[in-house]
Interface confidence: low
């Protein structure tokens, strides 16, 4: 009789990224017998949960169950029923929940408690919901992109060569931008660190990595905008805020109570003689850039070199993958090409920001106005953060690769998180014959 190929034994995993602005559910799959190889896990689905981030449900926790339903039901459809019980589900909450916890540990716990109870109702193997640290977020993002780029193994990867291939095993640095925080993680040239808080040691696939990481809370694009508004309204003589970071002709009313809701604006808080103010866009990149730079305190540095706000940053080394909002914003602005120089990006930003709001609305009719209105700020903020915050230069700009997906998997912390929690990244290089997961337990 002819040999029939046995059905492949596939495993699945689910990670929910509970970010500050929204929650996304990722489904990963991999061949069971290859689970300790590098590069075999890949994403099969992303489901974006309708609504804001979970931290916004603090006053309406009873709605969290319904909020998560659609995407959890989608996971039920995608993953074969026979696999449900052995499919792990993890939820990691990031900076939005870190901020809520700073305001009230009790409220943050209440949200997580309801999230856990909701997710426990599904037929999967729920492993818990927790607020991950900024350091973890940076580290797992770094693991994700280097895992997907095949940097952890000398072996030929199962997928085709990716566009960012540099034909060496030097790892990529990771630049992650969220709504409430931003992370920078890379292997510096000098292995000794002046700041132990920013140092991580990994042994992955038989190799040691000394990694620098830092997460800047309140410097995600949304919280940075709140910070900028709070800073600028201090010097506005009344309830009109002329804002160079919004398109000419753009108008929006902001409640002062909303402005001071976040812990990120506490340092700028003052008693204002009005309850609301109106943003009036004037669309000037240069002035917007100047305003953004005021968010970075570069006058104090207790180390040989700092990023900003007195945080140690070693000299940049190697290539960097910039993902999440770094990618979403630059992709919208059509500025992700490797061929676009930093000077060109700046020139394009100047043009974009100066376009009248009415024109912008017409040109991008399908884009929600809330998001559309903020691309000028976000693009300017990204440039300021990378150049003045992290000290990239016009020359080193070409080492930044704006990455959305690598071989169909989103760049971000979720894959690295799951790989770690499922013990799928061995400390030692596996034998050439793929062995089962239990070998490494």
């Amino acid at each position: 009789t002819q040999n029939k190929a046995l059905p492949e034994n596939i495993k699945y995993g689910i990670v929910l990224d509970a970010g500050s602005s929204h929650t996304s559910l990722y489904i990963y799959k991999w061949p069971a017998e290859k689970e300790n190889d590098t590069g075999v896990v890949h994403q099969v689905e992303e489901c974006r949960v309708k609504g804001p981030g979970i931290s916004k449900y603090v006053q309406k926790v009873n709605e969290i169950g319904i909020y998560l339903t659609d995407c959890m039901e989608r996971a039920r459809e995608v993953i074969p029923r026979s696999q449900h019980q052995e499919t792990p589900v993890y939820l990691g909450a990031t900076a939005g929940m870190r901020l809520l916890r700073m305001e009230s540990e009790e409220l943050a716990d209440r949200v997580l408690d309801v999230v856990e109870r909701s997710l426990s109702n599904y037929p999967f193997d729920f492993q818990g919901a927790r607020i991950i640290t900024g350091q973890e977020e940076g580290a797992y993002g770094w693991i994700t992109i280097n895992y997907l780029l095949g940097k952890f193994s000398q072996k030929t990867r199962w997928f085709s060569i990716v566009p960012y291939e540099t034909n060496n095993q030097e790892t990529f640095g990771a630049l992650d931008l969220g709504g409430a925080s931003t992370q920078i993680t890379f292997v510096p040239q000098n292995q000794t660190t002046e700041s132990p808080d920013n140092a991580l040691q990994f042994r992955l696939y038989g190799k040691d990595y000394n990694v620098y990481t830092h997460s800047f809370l309140c410097y995600g694009k949304d919280q940075a905008l709140w910070q900028k508004l709070a800073k600028d309204i201090q010097v506005a003589s009344n309830e009109i805020l002329r804002d160079p970071c919004f398109h000419p002709g753009y108008k929006k009313v902001v409640n002062v109570s909303d402005l001071y809701k976040t812990p990120c604006t506490k340092r700028f808080e003052m008693t204002l003689p009005f309850q609301q103010f109106e943003i009036q866009g004037i669309g000037n990149y240069q002035q917007c850039h100047q305003s953004v730079l005021e968010l970075f305190n570069t006058s104090y540095c207790p180390y040989s070199q700092c990023a900003f706000n007195g945080i140690f940053l070693p000299p940049l080394q190697g290539d960097f993958g910039a993902f999440s909002a770094f990618y979403f914003v630059m992709n919208f602005l059509n500025l992700t090409s490797e061929k676009v120089s930093q000077e060109k990006v700046t020139e394009m930003m100047k043009k974009f920001c100066s376009q009248p709001w009415e024109e912008i609305k017409t040109s991008y009719a399908g884009v929600k106005e809330k998001y559309l209105s903020e691309y000028c700020f976000s693009g300017t903020y990204i440039l300021s953060l990378l150049l003045q915050g992290y000290h990239f230069t016009a020359d080193s700009w070409e080492h930044i690769h704006f990455i959305g997906k690598i071989q169909g998997s989103d760049a971000g912390w979720t894959l690295g998180y799951m790989l770690n929690l499922t013990n799928m990244i061995p400390a030692e290089q596996p034998l050439s014959t793929p062995l089962s997961h239990s070998t490494y337990v």
Partner: antibody, heavy 119, light 109 residues
Framework: EVQLVQSGAEVKKPGATVKISCKVS????????MHWVQQAPGKGLEWMGR????????KYAEKFKNRVTITADTSTNTVYMELSSLRSEDTAVYYC????????????WGQGVMVTVSS | DIVLTQSPALAVSPGQRATITCRTQ??????????MNWYQQKPGQPPKLLIY???SLASGVPARFSGSGSGTDFTLTINPVEADDTANYYC????????FGGGTKVEIK
Amino acid sequence: EVQLVQSGAEVKKPGATVKISCKVSGDSITAYFMHWVQQAPGKGLEWMGRIDPDHERTKYAEKFKNRVTITADTSTNTVYMELSSLRSEDTAVYYCATERVPGFETDYWGQGVMVTVSS
Amino acid sequence: DIVLTQSPALAVSPGQRATITCRTQQTVDHYGTTYMNWYQQKPGQPPKLLIYLASSLASGVPARFSGSGSGTDFTLTINPVEADDTANYYCQQSRNLWTFGGGTKVEIK
């Protein structure tokens, strides 16, 4: 080309209310802030207030705050200014004006409406 | 409100330079943009914009008109003055809603 055409001259008694219109042609009023400016005979220009027709939000000068109401009708592309409790010192020419980008060129002005308050 | 103070009157001969000043009670600058505009008004006509953002010439306005200044002190210069320039000139701030100066009456001798 954008044009602002204002309603005709008015004669009112003290204590009465006047409502002046400003019809815009050539562009939608939602693209602008619409301002009203008062000019008494032989006197200077005095800003009264403005409306953002897009969101129906108004701002008024302190001097006129309790007596002026600015409204907009986007269906007819017309802006209105109503001044109540008229007194003789309200005798003036009233102009409507557009402001597309706050603080940049004030694009267009109406021809003005003479309002006379006399018993 | 931001109060604007202008020199009240000026008499100039044709071909000469006319300088009109305007002082604001507080700055009308914001992030490098100066929200000062200048208007010309002739009897029976609405005001006509001459200069915006302190020094930008409005379209269709002769280059004889120029604006300068920042912060709280501003100048409108007409050089050379022509007979047709007899009018009232108003400064206006638009940093914070609108306020006009009291006006400067320019007479050509």
